[in-house]
Interface confidence: low
């Protein structure tokens, strides 16, 4: 006998990433005979579900399930019919549903039940809809990034597996309602809740991870809006010349703005709020999101959360990528250093509404929020996580790797379908009849 290749039959897996602002469906594929290889699973296709995230259907759970139908119909086309029954289908919900579960557990249960009901109607191997913990979201994002970049294990030209010397990459994810930081660390965590130990391909990894609920982009924008209403009566992060009617019920309905909620307020009242293009006041407003006053550990990131010093290279994805990409591509600003990132944020915050619209034609949605978004990303990385210039040099802002979206979804599927074994891979034996 000798080592042989079997016919390249493909297997498929589907993950619905139910985020706070929207849901994305990812279909993955891999050769059936190479399930335990690294870097073998790749993205086959994807689909963005129209409308808001499933947590936005708190008052209409059936609407949540119905919103998924278009993408599920696409999945029926994208996965060969003979593979439908053997294709695992997962739905994982993140911080939007974690927030809903805090404020209205009955509604979150109803949404998951409605979604489950619809997903079971399809011919795939449905394996559950659940809310991921912040820790899971962080770790699976880290697994995805390192799997795609082949940092766990590699197949050498001499025909054997080896562990690459470059080490693993840290992962930073900025979602709509939470943000996660995850990286390999040598020292044990002082806070056990922040440590995860993984055994992948015979290697042991000690990983630090933390998820900050209410520090996702959308919730940060809501919190800044609440602060602006409370302290200024104008919004220093919005461009001068931009004005909008703010419904107080919108601002204060999130648990993330609960602390800023006035004792008595009319939820149906509308307040006119204008921008002032003030980068310094905006920076102060963003600074107010972070607390550095008390730390029960030897060192903390912010809000009393333990974090070892950031080490090694990092990949920053989701809204980290979109924010930096806007600065780089739409605004034409350099962001290679922390200093440049800060200067770019100040530059955007200095623009009037007319200047911003002229500079970024055709992009109206969320345009007024890029100043706050950029200021937040810069402060989160430098002050929050403690990246200095040297460490920041090792951060890459990326949306995809190996034609696959970077996020928790792939890592989640790899874990649940046992596509990353704990043991080192061995060669399969077969008989060559040729």
């Amino acid at each position: 006998t000798r080592d042989v290749r079997e016919p390249p039959a493909l297997k498929y897996g589907i993950v619905l990433d139910a985020g706070s602002s929207h849901t994305s469906m990812f279909i993955y594929k891999w050769p059936a005979d190479k399930e335990n290889d690294t870097g073998i699973v790749g993205q086959h296709s994807s689909c963005d579900v129209p409308g808001g995230g499933i947590s936005s259907y708190a008052d209409n759970p059936s609407g949540a399930s119905q919103s998924l139908v278009g993408c599920l119909e696409q999945a029926l086309q994208d996965v060969p019919k003979e593979r439908h029954a053997g294709t695992p289908l997962y739905l994982g919900a993140t911080a939007g549903m974690r927030l809903l579960n805090l404020t209205n557990p009955e509604a979150s249960t109803s949404v998951l039940m409605a979604v489950t009901h619809t997903l079971t109607q399809y011919p795939f191997d449905f394996r559950g809809a659940r809310i991921l913990s912040g820790q899971e979201e962080g770790v699976f994002g880290w697994v995805t990034a390192n799997y795609l970049l082949e940092n766990f294990i590699k197949y050498g030209w001499v025909g054997r597996w080896f562990r690459p010397r470059k080490g693993t990459l840290g992962a930073m994810d900025l979602g709509g309602a939470s943000t996660q930081i995850t990286f390999e660390t040598t020292s044990p965590a002082e806070d056990r809740a922040s440590e995860v130990q993984l055994h992948l391909y015979g290697q042991h990894y000690r990983v630090y991870t933390h998820s900050f609920l209410c520090y996702g982009r959308d919730q940060v924008l809501q919190r800044l809006l609440a602060s602006a209403l409370q302290t200024h009566g104008f919004h220093p992060c919005w461009p001068r010349g931009f004005s909008t009617q703010v419904l107080l019920g919108d601002v204060y309905q999130s648990p993330c703005t609960m602390a800023q909620r006035p004792q008595n307020f009319n939820s149906s009242a509308r307040v006119s709020l204008s921008g002032s293009s003030d980068p310094h006041l905006c920076r102060d407003l963003v600074s107010g999101l972070f607390s550095f006053s008390s730390c029960p550990f030897s060192r903390c990131s912010f809000n009393g959360v333990f974090q070892p010093p950031v080490a090694g290279n990092f990949v920053a994805f989701s809204a980290f990528f979109y924010t930096v990409d806007f600065l780089r591509t739409s605004m034409g600003l350099p962001v290679a250093t922390l200093q440049q990132l800060e200067a770019a944020a100040v530059n955007v915050c200095n623009q009037t509404w007319a200047q911003l619209q002229a500079r970024v034609p055709g992009q109206r949605a969320r345009l007024a929020d890029y100043c706050a978004g950029a200021m937040f990303v810069q402060q989160l990385l430098s002050r929050g996580y403690g990246f200095d210039e040297r460490a920041f040099g090792g951060v890459i802002f990326q949306k995809k790797a190996a034609d696959t979206a970077v996020g928790w979804a792939l890592g989640y599927m790899l874990n649940l379908t046992n596509l990353i074994p704990a043991d080192p891979p061995g060669l399969r034996k077969g008989t060559d009849f040729s």
Partner: antibody, heavy 125, light 106 residues
């Protein structure tokens, strides 16, 4: 203007089935879910279920599963509800109601903004 | 399922009087809608999402509340307000209605 016109009253025998209709006009039929609500004499309103005309997906209150079947004919902008194995306790006025909604910071909130005039179904031997 | 209890079951008021109808939920709900139903007619949306007046509804109607307790207030009752008023929740499957409060005008 937006209108929902339901079919006329029905008198049916126990064990039989009945199919009532709800014709919509004045709006794009596939843009809104259609719900059905039961009002038995002296009882509170009960939500039966709904249908999304765009995707032809219906959702039911557990209590009405097997009793009610909701369908649509999008070409006729009409929703239907069939009630089977009728018993005296199914005697009620049945309403179709359009599910209106408004967006509230990215969250859809729903309510019944337009109602049909109701169809009285009497189950009697 | 969430049970909505309305009180009082019947209320008699004179024109010009200010009245309050209440709706109590068996567990916390996000929002309540109110409907008005006159004899022989279909229900009509009065207030949506606790406090928003539906189109064409006079300003004498107002709603408030949160959690498990909600109210509908008519600041100055008119003869045409004689009807049954229902509260309705969309926070948890299945959507449910209250038993109704019948408003009679003296």
């Amino acid at each position: 203007q937006v209108q929902l016109v339901q079919s006329g009253a029905e008198v049916v025998k126990p064990g039989a089935s009945v199919k009532i209709s709800c014709k919509a006009s004045g709006y794009t039929f596939t843009d809104y879910n259609m719900d059905w609500v039961k009002q038995a004499p002296g009882q509170r309103l009960e939500w039966i279920g709904d249908i999304n005309p765009k995707y032809d997906i219906s959702t039911y209150n557990q209590q009405f599963k097997g009793k009610a079947t909701i369908t649509v004919d999008t070409s006729a902008s009409t929703a239907y509800m069939e009630l089977s194995s009728l018993r005296s306790e199914d005697t009620a006025v049945y309403y179709c109601a359009r599910r209106g909604f408004f967006l509230y910071y990215g969250i859809n909130y729903y309510y019944f903004d337009v109602w049909g005039q109701g169809t009285l179904v009497t189950v009697s031997s | 399922e969430i049970v909505l209890t309305q009180s009082p079951a019947t209320l008699s008021a004179s024109p010009g009087e200010r009245i309050t109808l209440s709706c109590s939920a068996s567990s916390s709900v996000s929002y309540i809608h109110w409907y008005q139903q006159k004899p022989g007619q279909a229900p009509r949306l009065l207030i949506y999402s606790t406090s928003n007046l539906a189109s064409g509804i006079p300003a004498r109607f107002s709603g408030s509340g949160s959690g498990t307790f909600y109210t509908l207030t008519i600041s100055s009752v008119e003869p045409e307000d004689a009807a049954v008023y229902y509260c309705h929740q969309w926070s948890s499957y299945p959507w449910t209605f209250g038993g109704g409060t019948k408003l009679e005008i003296k």
